[in-house]
Amino acid sequence: AESCTSRPHITVVEGEPFYLKHCSCSLAHEIETTTKSWYKSSGSQEHVELNPRSSSRIALHDCVLEFWPVELNDTGSYFFQMKNYTQKWKLNVIRRNKHSCFTERQVTSKIVEVKKFFQITCENSYYQTLVNSTSLYKNCKKLLLENNKNPTIKKNAEFEDQGYYSCVHFLHHNGKLFNITKTFNITIVEDRSNIVPVLLGPKLNHVAVELGKNVRLNCSALLNEEDVIYWMFGEENGSDPNIHEEKEMRIMTPEGKWHASKVLRIENIGESNLNVLYNCTVASTGGTDTKSFILVRKADMADIPGHVFTR
């Protein structure tokens, strides 16, 4: 069953079918004999009771007040009263945009991330039995879709999908043709979950070492799942049997990003390992960032300012 109209302030477009459904509907069925009344007040007029005789455009069904269609002069406050239950709505009927297939003030905005699932389904459960056909328009151009009862778009979003999508339901009532338009302003944005990966610590690190000993150079980064972290050294990686790239360690952060750590192990340090760059690079779709390590003999430490050392 169609849910009741709980919003106290409603804006609708002139010329379309519209309904108000009160929220004690199940209760109303239990007390069939109870007097149920609908009222309208606008400007100078105080509580005027509504009935089908007051306007050929108004219909009353159980829990619903229907407009066939709603017009500008229907703007005002509406009340439903039953015993000690009252519900009130403030209705604002706005002008239809004659130069467009939709009215800008009646647009629902949605933001969809590129490559994420994007769906538009044209449905209208209340008028479902009366709807002859439904068309879906993008920027007021009709889309040719297979299902003309409930046209649907289901796809992974592309930037080109951005635009105004209007579902137009065509229906007959008492021999007259009406249409109901629901428009979505779809904005496609970049994947907001991606971060710019960051290498942690200083960009240049001098490491004090002793010949013949081993050293572990730790490269850590905060990155996205698809980003890569790797070491570059010498002419061609792997040419030095004393240098080993350890298995990368990854831990997921509470925000769904990754903390990655990759160690370069240099065993039996020799002269050839000194004063050369060992570069750790993180690469992402945004580019690369690199931090460098230089091994320096402990005896030479005095020549370098203390703040550049990593021990």
Epitope: F159, E190, N194, V196, E225, E226, V228, I229, Y230, K247, E248, R250, A260, A283, S284, T285, G286, G287, T288, D289, T290
Partner: antibody
């Protein structure tokens, strides 16, 4: 609309320099690196290098090191590729492309090097 | 540098038939930390920039017809066109984006038999 718009064709003499621009629109410029790829007439694709739009870091192909410079201007969302000491075998269509797999390409800029 | 080698250099296939292009990398482009293959496939028609078809070795770019599929892992990859259409005549390239320089294969020219 998401696009990369490149500067127009250039004719240069050997030894000269050329600077090709690539203006990005429709997306956050600093979220993606810009790669430059060239294609000599009737040949395959050659990756020249790339620049990180968020930090200006560059990686160049070894064979072009010293002759190529890639820069960005984040205020105008534009990437530039300058190639110096041009030779006849630099005659090619130069493309800019976004990211590390290239879902978005510029239309290409033909650079002709001829005496 | 990672060298990408495509085979065959050219291929002629009848309309509606299956076309298969292979790409081999000189070292693995599979990243064990996330189990992704850093490989893409492109289609290039004369006078146009290349068009991305597949990335992560098997993920089809949105808008690409589902007759295009990518498979493989590590060093051996395949681009398959399940039922060749006239508009598929082009040169196809594989590219690794695992390590800089991000190298391309030499290209495979696909024609109609």
């Amino acid at each position: 609309q998401v696009q990369l718009v490149q500067s127009g064709a250039e004719v240069k003499k050997p030894g000269a320099s050329v600077k090709v621009s690539c203006k990005a629109s429709g997306y956050t410029f600093t979220s993606y690196g810009i790669s430059w790829v060239r294609q000599a007439p009737g040949q395959g694709l050659e990756w020249m290098g790339w620049i990180s739009a968020y930090n200006g870091n560059t990686n160049y192909a070894q064979k072009l090191q010293g002759r190529v410079t890639m820069t960005t201007d984040t205020s105008t969302s534009t990437a530039y590729m300058e190639l110096r000491s041009l030779r006849s075998d630099d005659t090619a269509v130069y493309y800019c492309a976004r990211g590390w797999y290239f879902a978005l390409w510029g239309r290409g800029t033909l650079v002709t090097v001829s005496s | 540098d990672i060298v990408m080698t495509q085979s065959p250099d050219s291929l002629a296939v009848s309309l509606g038939e299956r076309a298969t292009i292979n790409c081999k990398s000189s070292q693995s482009v599979l990243y064990s930390s996330n189990n992704r293959n850093y490989l893409a496939w492109y289609q290039q028609k004369p006078g146009q920039p290349p068009k991305l078809l597949i990335y992560w070795a098997s993920t089809r770019e949105s808008g690409v017809p589902d007759r295009f599929s990518g498979s493989g892992s590590g060093t051996d990859f395949t681009l398959t066109i399940s039922s060749l259409q006239a508009e598929d005549v082009a040169v196809y390239y594989c590219q690794q984006f695992y390590r800089t320089p991000y190298t391309f294969g030499q290209g495979t020219k696909l024609e109609i038999k």
